[in-house]
Amino acid sequence: NFMYSKTVKRLSKLQEYQQYYPSLTCVMEGKDMEDWSCCPTPWTSFQSSCYFISTVMQSWTKSQNNCSVMGADLVVINTKEEQDFITQNLKINSAYFLGLSDPKGWRHWQWVDQTPYNKNVTFWHSGEPNSPDERCAIINFRSEEWGWNDVHCHVPQKSICKMKKIYI
């Protein structure tokens, strides 16, 4: 009876999410494997988040709006492990917007989700950021490694969206 009611709850939750995400990919987790964590298909998952790589070339503001429509934000990178996971799926000759910007050009960088900007957990390429006119951050492959660079916000780039996993 308990299992039945849990399944009914799950199905109703799935139906609720289906209006936003036509397809979800879910895995069982938790100590009793009773919880399902889901990401929209074809998003990838890492820890408690889902990631989507957009190959559409758009400005930073349009890229953030695009993520927002999908219930996400441009990616906020919190650890080196997270960055290493993300970069596995990126093309080395491309650049991708991050959810990091400096709208006033005062070198006050801010994450889109209001996560405090911690200088100790940043992965700027050597010599970056280097221009107060370049107020948005990308991740790209340079000098044999992935890192961040400041660029003009209005220049179209690919982008990465991130959202919390859906638990049902």
């Epitope: 758009q58 400005s59 503001t61 709006n65 709208p103 050009g105 221009s131 107060p132 006119d133 209005h154």
Partner: antibody, heavy 121, light 111 residues
Framework: EVQLVESGGGLVKPGGSLRLSCAAS????????MSWVRQAPGKGLEWVAT????????YYPDSVKGRFTISRDNAKNSLYLQMNSLRAEDTAVYYC??????????????WGQGTTVTVSS | DIVLTQSPASLAVSPGQRATITCRAS??????????MHWYQQKPGQPPKLLIY???NLESGVPARFSGSGSETDFTLTINPVEANDAANYYC?????????FGGGTKVEIK
């Protein structure tokens, strides 16, 4: 006082080339992105090319891509526009304009007086 | 590309009256309260001159008779009261995304 002075315009035959120059003074040229904007006779404004302050980024509309090249020499406080394979529709007054960044975009806060390019056989 | 449509194409205004020019963008040029729409004045034989930046900010040295408003896709330049030397073409321009684009212009004539 900020000054932008264009030169190099003139009459050229279709298929020909011209190099426009813009001499900047009164500000730290190397700190600003710069653009060329043109205006055909009796028409509106059309952006033609942009170059970032550090020369790392150039951008063109499809109408001139592959034919026009924007460049700068920060040591000489000068902006250039090399125009090749010129067409009749490139006939216009060409303005050099300084970009001032604001939030996620920019605007053109100073403009030169313009130089006239006429493409005709 | 973002298309900017200005209206009217021309208008004639008497000195002391109000002139209103609108600029409609094919998509939003706003982001979190910042509106990346700018206005320029161009008199015959002269280069454009910046009047208003970011929808409503008056450029230094521009008379307070000029004002701008709007957000997202709809923006307005107002001249009130109009003076004789305001006869010119007026252009809007967006910069939220490359390529930067201009409106087709509005010619203001003084009656």
């Amino acid at each position: 006082e900020v000054q932008l002075v264009e030169s190099g315009g003139g009459l050229v035959k279709p298929g020909g080339s011209l190099r426009l120059s813009c001499a900047a003074s009164g500000f730290t040229f190397s700190s600003y992105g710069m653009s060329w904007v043109r205006q055909a006779p009796g028409k509106g404004l059309e952006w033609v090319a942009t170059i970032s302050s550090g020369d790392s980024y150039t951008y063109y509309p499809d109408s001139v891509k592959g034919r026009f090249t924007i460049s700068r020499d920060n040591a000489k406080n000068s902006l250039y526009l090399q125009m090749n394979s010129l067409r009749a529709e490139d006939t216009a007054v060409y303005y050099c304009a300084r970009q001032l960044y604001y939030s996620y975009g920019y605007y053109f806060d100073y403009w030169g007086q313009g130089t006239t390019v006429t493409v005709s056989s | 590309d973002i298309v900017l449509t200005q209206s009217p194409a021309s208008l004639a205004v008497s000195p002391g009256q109000r002139a209103t020019i609108t600029c409609r963008a094919s998509e939003s040029v706003s982001f979190h309260g910042t509106h990346l729409m700018h206005w320029y004045q161009q008199k015959p034989g002269q280069p454009p001159k910046l009047l208003i930046y970011a929808a409503s900010n008056l450029e230094s040295g521009v008379p307070a008779r000029f004002s701008g408003s709007g957000s997202e896709t709809d923006f307005t330049l107002t001249i009130n009261p109009v003076e004789a030397n305001d006869a010119a073409n007026y252009y809007c321009q967006q910069s939220i995304e490359d390529p930067p684009t201009f409106g087709g212009g509005t010619k203001v004539e003084i009656k």
